[in-house]
C-alpha cells in the first residue's frame, strides 16, 4: 500500500482581520493509527494550534467529522482572526507509540492576514506660531497588514509634497505602524485653513482613512495698529481710537498710556470676525485737552495671546488747536471703551 | 454542554480494589482523552493516566503503573478508572477531566480498616 | 518526568496588591503545553490560562500569564477577594503528564 501523505493544497490564504481562517489538510491513507496535529511554525520552538484529542483550542474547530475512523480530512476553521495568527501552518501526522512520534508533515499553508489601519492620527505643535514660519505636524496609523501604504498630506485640497514617513517595523512583522512628518508654512490666511493626513491601503477598498488638524489650533496672527485723531467731539475733547486688526486668536488685552502712565486697561470682548477668520476690535479715550498745559503723547500697547506687548502711539498737541498726528510703533491686542482724561 | 458526572463516594478497606465511572454528556467520548487526577486531602493533584477511547489505548503514570486500570465504554460515554491494592494514602478525591479542559465533580475514596 | 515547582508555596496579600506566582519546570516545556488551573476548596480545578499565556472563557483581564522553556508565570494585576485561591501549573508537553505542588494565595 501507498504511504501516506500529508496534503496541504493551499500554499498560502489570505483572510480579514475579524473573519475565521480555513485551513486545509487532507490524509491519503488511515494507515498508520495515529492522530493529527496543527502548528505554526517548524522546529523545536512551533506552537501548537490543534490538537484532535485533548488541550483546549477554544478558537478551533474541524470542518469536518475528523474524529470518524474512515475520516480523511482534517481541515481546520480558526476563528477571529488577527494579525497574530499570521505564519506558515502545518498538518502534522503523527503515529501511535510510547510516545506518539511524527510520521509527516505537510508543506504547510502560509496565512496572512489583512489587518485595516487605525485612523490616522494628526498632531501639530505645541506652541502657536506666527505666518511665515515653517511648523511640522506629524500623523501615525497603526495596527495595519500587509506592509504596503500610501500615505499623503493635503492643505485645504492641495496636496504637500515637504515629508518625511517611516513604516515600522523594518522586517516582517505581524503588523505595521506608519509615522510621518509634514512641513507646513503658514499664511495670514490659515485661521481656516486644515491639514489632512489620508492613508490608502489594500483593506480599505479605495477609500482612504483621513485624520485632519485644523491650523487654528496652531497659528497665531499678531495684529495691526492704528492710532488715530477724530475730530474735535465737543469744545476742547479730542477722540483717539486704536484700531487692532487682522489678529487671531481672540485673547487680546488692551492698554491706554498717558505720557508713559497707565490710563485704562481692558480686555477684547466685542470683536467682529473677518472672512478669514481673524478678529478686529477698536478702543477709544475722550481726551480733555483743557486739562493739558504741554503736549500729551497718548500710547496704545496691545498684548496679544501671552506674546511681548506691542505699541502704536500718537503725540497730541495741546498748546495750539489739536491736529491729527501720529507716530508709529509696532502693534499687539484689543479693546472698546471710552475714558475722559481730566 | 460539556458534562462530566462522577460516580458517588466509596470507602474500601485496604487490600480492596475500588472503581470510579465518569458519564459524560454534550459531547462524543471517542473524540477526546479522559484523563484521571489524583488528589490526596489538603495535598495538590497528581496525574494517574489517560486512555483514549477510540481505541482504548491507555498512558499510566510511573508511580500508579500496575495497580490502575482505565477503560472506557463508548456506547455509554462512559470512562473508568479502577485501583486495586488499596492501601491508606490512596484516600483522595479522584477526577475524570476531558483532554484537560473540563473536569468531573470528584469522587471521594476512603481507605479505612 | 518532568517537575514542575512552584513557588512561593503560600503568597500572603491584600485585595489591590499584585501577585506573581512561578512555575520552575525540570526540563524545557513548550508554551503551548503550560497550562495553570485554579482550585477552591471542596471544589474541582478550573482551567484558568492555557496555552501559556490565554485566558480561559470567562477569567478576567487582571490575570495574565508568560513565560517560555523552564520558567512561568500567572500574575494579577490587581487582587479581588475572589482571587484567593490555590493555583497549579500543569505540563503535557511529555508522559507523564504533572502538576505543580500548587501556590495557596491567601488574604493577608
Known amino acids: 500500500e501507498e504511504e501516506l501523505q500529508v496534503i496541504q493544497p493551499d500554499k498560502s490564504v489570505s483572510v480579514a482581520a475579524g473573519e475565521s481562517a480555513i485551513l486545509h489538510c487532507t490524509v491519503t491513507s488511515l494507515i498508520p493509527v495515529g492522530p493529527i496535529q496543527w502548528f505554526r511554525g517548524a522546529g523545536p520552538a512551533r506552537e501548537l494550534i490543534y490538537n484532535q484529542k485533548e488541550g483546549h483550542f477554544p478558537r478551533v474547530t474541524t470542518v469536518s467529522e475528523s474524529t470518524k475512523r474512515e475520516n480523511m480530512d482534517f481541515s481546520i476553521s480558526i476563528s477571529n482572526i488577527t494579525p497574530a495568527d499570521a505564519g506558515t501552518y502545518y498538518c502534522v501526522k503523527f503515529r501511535k507509540g510510547s510516545p506518539d512520534t511524527e510520521f509527516k508533515s505537510g508543506a504547510g499553508t502560509e496565512l496572512s492576514v489583512r489587518a485595516k489601519p487605525s485612523a490616522p492620527v494628526v498632531s501639530g505643535p505645541a506652541a502657536r506660531a506666527t505666518p511665515q514660519h515653517t511648523v511640522s505636524f506629524t500623523c501615525e496609523s497603526h495596527g495595519f497588514s500587509p506592509r504596503d501604504i500610501t500615505l499623503k498630506w493635503f492643505k485645504n485640497g492641495n496636496e504637500l509634497s515637504d515629508f518625511q514617513t517611516n513604516v515600522d517595523p523594518v522586517g516582517e512583522s505581524v503588523s505595521y505602524s506608519i509615522h510621518s512628518t509634514a512641513k507646513v508654512v503658514l499664511t495670514r490666511e490659515d485661521v481656516h485653513s486644515q491639514v489632512i493626513c489620508e492613508v490608502a491601503h489594500v483593506t480599505l477598498q479605495g477609500d482612504p482613512l483621513r485624520g485632519t488638524a485644523n491650523l487654528s489650533e496652531t497659528i497665531r496672527v499678531p495684529p495691526t495698529l492704528e492710532v488715530t485723531q477724530q475730530p474735535v467731539r465737543a469744545e476742547n475733547q479730542v477722540n483717539v481710537t486704536c484700531q487692532v486688526r487682522k489678529f487671531y486668536p481672540q485673547r487680546l488685552q488692551l492698554t491706554w498710556l498717558e505720557n508713559g502712565n497707565v490710563s485704562r486697561t481692558e480686555t477684547a470682548s466685542t470683536v467682529t470676525e473677518n472672512k478669514d477668520g481673524t478678529y478686529n476690535w477698536m478702543s477709544w479715550l475722550l481726551v480733555n485737552v483743557s486739562a493739558h498745559r504741554d503736549d500729551v503723547k497718548l500710547t496704545c500697547q496691545v498684548e496679544h495671546d501671552g506674546q511681548p506687548a506691542v505699541s502704536k502711539s500718537h503725540d497730541l498737541k495741546v498748546s495750539a488747536h489739536p491736529k491729527e498726528q501720529g507716530s508709529n510703533t509696532a502693534a499687539e491686542n484689543t479693546g472698546s471703551n471710552e475714558r475722559n482724561i481730566y | 454542554e460539556v458534562q462530566l458526572v462522577q460516580s458517588g463516594a466509596e470507602v474500601k478497606k485496604p487490600g480492596a480494589t475500588v472503581k470510579i465511572s465518569c458519564k459524560v454528556s454534550?459531547?462524543?467520548?471517542?473524540?477526546?482523552?479522559m484523563h484521571w487526577v489524583q488528589q490526596a486531602p489538603g495535598k495538590g493533584l497528581e496525574w494517574i493516566g489517560r486512555i483514549d477511547p477510540e481505541d482504548a489505548e491507555t498512558k499510566y503514570a510511573p508511580k500508579f503503573q500496575g495497580r490502575v486500570t482505565i477503560t472506557a465504554d463508548t456506547s455509554t460515554d462512559t470512562a473508568y478508572m479502577e485501583l486495586s491494592s488499596l492501601r491508606s494514602e490512596d484516600t483522595a478525591v479522584y477526577y475524570c477531566?476531558?483532554?484537560?479542559?473540563?473536569w468531573g465533580q470528584g469522587t471521594l475514596v476512603t481507605v479505612s480498616s | 518526568e518532568i517537575v514542575l515547582t512552584q513557588s512561593p508555596a503560600t503568597l500572603s496579600l491584600s485585595p489591590g496588591e499584585r501577585a506573581t506566582l512561578s512555575c520552575s519546570a525540570s526540563s524545557s516545556v513548550s508554551s503551548s503545553y503550560l497550562y495553570w488551573y485554579q482550585q477552591k476548596p471542596g471544589q474541582a480545578p478550573k482551567l484558568w490560562i492555557y496555552?501559556?499565556?490565554n485566558l480561559a472563557s470567562g477569567i478576567p483581564a487582571r490575570f495574565s500569564g508568560s513565560g517560555s522553556g523552564t520558567d512561568y508565570t500567572l500574575t494579577i494585576s490587581s487582587l479581588e477577594p475572589e482571587d484567593f485561591a490555590v493555583y497549579y501549573c500543569?505540563?503535557?508537553?511529555?508522559?507523564?503528564?504533572?502538576f505543580g505542588q500548587g501556590t495557596k494565595l491567601e488574604i493577608k
Open positions: 477531566d476531558r483532554g484537560l479542559a473540563y
Open positions: 496555552s501559556t499565556s
Open positions: 500543569h505540563q503535557w508537553s511529555s508522559y507523564p503528564y504533572t
Open positions: 454534550g459531547f462524543n467520548i471517542k473524540d477526546y482523552y
